[in-house]
Every structure is written in structure tokens, then in C-alpha cells.
Amino acid sequence: TPEVWVQVRMEATELSSFTIRCGFLGSGSISLVTVSWGGPNGAGGTTLAVLHPERGIRQWAPARQARWETQSSISLILEGSGASSPCANTTFCCKFASFPEGSWEACGSLPPSSDPGLSAPPTPAPILRAD
């Protein structure tokens, strides 16, 4: 069964800066990745970035530097200040559309006890949804 993992890390140098990494553990080819915050897309979440292997990348503030890390994982930096800044309990979700598996989504947030600069290892997040 395919899985999606989400890792959220707060940067030690900037406490309002977060790095989100997501990956797809499956054999299919990825056709689209959507990153959102505040919950899943379509369920009260806000699209932060969309990444397509051929058509490129779009991102919306406070997202910066969305990029492919590998063919099956992506990363994204959030630089926030004021109202647009993410907080420690913000939920981030990644949805991977792949062929032939379909769409798989997982969400994660900063581990509650983590210090800046530290993060939990990238494990499959508890919220998992297949369309």
C-alpha cells in the first residue's frame, strides 16, 4: 500500500521559518503534489504550493523555495511574519497524485516537544487519505 510521509521542522536561526518535507512511498509515477496548511485541501486548508514534474512549480506566500528533492519527495520553506506566520501547532498536508495508485494525502505538524532546529524523523503521518 502506498504511503505519504510528512516532516515539519522549525529552523533554529529563524523561529518563524519552517521547513516542510514530504515524500511518497509507492511504485507509481507522481503527476502532481499539493502542499497545504491548516488542514487538507478541500477541508479548510490553504494551498501553499503545487508541484508538477513537467509544468513546473507554483507557490503562494508565505511559502518559498518549493522544490523537488527526488522524483518522489519535495521540500518547502515557509517564511512568516505577523498574521501570515505559521505557528508551532500548524498542520501541514501533502497530497500526491500518482499513476496508477491515485491520490494519497498525509498531514503532520511540528512535534510538540521539539526544539528549534530539531525534528522528528520522517515517518508516515497519522492522517492518511486515499481518493
Epitope: 491548516g38 488542514g39 485541501n41 478541500g42 479548510g44 486548508g45 490553504t46 494551498t47 503545487v50 508538477h52 509544468r55 513546473g56 507554483r58 503562494w60 506566500a61
Partner: antibody, heavy 119, light 106 residues
Framework: QVQLQQSGPELVKPGASVKISCRSS????????INWVKQRPGQGLEWIGW????????YYNEKFKGKATLTVDKSSTTAYMLLSSLTSEDSAVYFC????????????WGQGTTLTVSS | DIQMTQSPSSLSASLGGKVTITCKAS??????IAWYQQKPGKGPRLLIH???TLQPGIPSRFSGSGSGRNSSFSISNLEPEDIATYYC????????FGGGTKLEIK
């Protein structure tokens, strides 16, 4: 087909407020950012801000913070822009525009709403 | 904030000819530039995004290129319906429009 239909022209007095609407059809309203753009007579285009209808998340151009307030009504797939404390500098045509994501920014536009501020 | 300097502000060209408009950003915009056509009394129309990607239904007479801070937009084989004002837009970091270029036919 995708359409954005804006409300009609407005003539208002200085100091008053006005609410402009932009009704979307032909796509999933909650999946795409709606942007607002100002164009003064004979001038260029200025980005005011955006709202993501799926979550009500807003982001404003610093210049328009306190001047514009963006909201949506999901049930009617309509975006609104409230402009307050109006002066003659606010007289302009205001456009709403959908951000198409990978299809391109501002890929569909409303027809524009003309606002005239005059006593 | 990223500033966009668009030039020229106006130009005149002959039917069948070619024109080129340039936009210079105050910093690298990673190819995130779009070009719009606006006719009097109408909303703008997206022609090109991501520097050179033509929107569906837009004739191949329109083209875009560039990298880093510099971008250009060209129309070849000018036709009467190309009379309009053209704007660039950077969307790498929020949104900033260029000042516009008014195209007239000689």
C-alpha cells in the same frame, strides 16, 4: 466555462465605504485564489491582495492594508472587496481575477467595477 | 518588494512587423513572469506565463523569453487586433505589474 461576474458601477461620497462583488462560476470556487487589482484612469495595474476561498486566508499588498478587506461567501461562490474611508484616490476600476495555479496567474478576469468617489 | 521596469511605455509599428517589449525586475524572479493584453474598457487577458508558456488559444505570433531579472515579449506579423496595452507581471514573490506598453499601428 470559467466566468467571473462583477457588480455594477458605484458612485459614493468621500469617507464612505463600498462593497464590490465578484461571482465565480464554471470551476471549483474553493480550489483557486481570487485576486483583486486596481486600475486608475489611464494608469497601470496594481495588485491589492488575494483570498483563498477554501479557508478565507488573505494576503494584502502593504499599500492596501486598512483600505481593502477581502471576504468570500462559499454558498454563492462570490468574493467581496470592502473599500473603506474612500477618497478621490480610490476612484478606479477594480478587477477580480482567478489565479489558475499551474495554468498561470490571473488566468480569468472579471469585467471590472468602476468606482467613482465624489461629493 | 520586487519592482518591475517595463519599456518602452509606448511604441508604433507597421502591420506585418515585429515588436519587442522588455521587463526588468529588481531581483531574480526565477522565470515567474506573465504577459497580459488589455484593450480599452476590458479586463486584461493572459497571453503567456512562466516566461514562455503560451496560454491555450493564443496565436504563436506571441512569444516570451528571458531569465534572471530580464524578460522580453514579442509579437510578430502584427495584426490590427493587436492594438492594445501590454503588461508584464512578476509572480515569484507576491505580484507586481510593469507600467504597461501602449502599442499602436503606423
Amino acid at each position: 466555462q470559467v466566468q467571473l461576474q462583477q457588480s455594477g458601477p458605484e458612485l459614493v461620497k468621500p469617507g464612505a465605504s463600498v462593497k464590490i462583488s465578484c461571482r465565480s462560476s464554471g470551476y471549483t470556487f474553493t480550489d483557486y485564489y481570487i485576486n483583486w487589482v486596481k486600475q486608475r484612469p489611464g494608469q497601470g495595474l496594481e495588485w491589492i491582495g488575494w483570498i483563498f476561498p477554501g479557508s478565507d486566508y488573505t494576503y494584502y499588498n502593504e499599500k492596501f492594508k486598512g483600505k481593502a478587506t477581502l471576504t468570500v461567501d462559499k454558498s454563492s461562490t462570490t468574493a467581496y472587496m470592502l473599500l473603506s474611508s474612500l477618497t478621490s484616490e480610490d476612484s478606479a476600476v477594480y478587477f477580480c481575477a482567478r489565479d489558475g495555479g499551474l495554468r498561470g496567474p490571473f488566468d480569468y478576469w472579471g469585467q471590472g467595477t468602476t468606482l467613482t468617489v465624489s461629493s | 518588494d520586487i519592482q518591475m521596469t517595463q519599456s518602452p511605455s509606448s511604441l508604433s509599428a507597421s502591420l506585418g512587423g515585429k515588436v519587442t517589449i522588455t521587463c526588468k525586475a529588481s531581483q531574480d524572479i526565477n522565470k515567474y513572469i506573465a504577459w497580459y493584453q488589455q484593450k480599452p474598457g476590458k479586463g486584461p487577458r493572459l497571453l503567456i506565463h512562466y516566461t514562455s508558456t503560451l496560454q491555450p488559444g493564443i496565436p504563436s505570433r506571441f512569444s516570451g523569453s528571458g531569465s534572471g531579472r530580464n524578460s522580453s515579449f514579442s509579437i510578430s506579423n502584427l495584426e490590427p487586433e493587436d492594438i492594445a496595452t501590454y503588461y508584464c507581471l512578476q509572480y515569484d514573490n507576491l505580484h507586481t505589474f510593469g507600467g504597461g506598453t501602449k502599442l499602436e499601428i503606423k
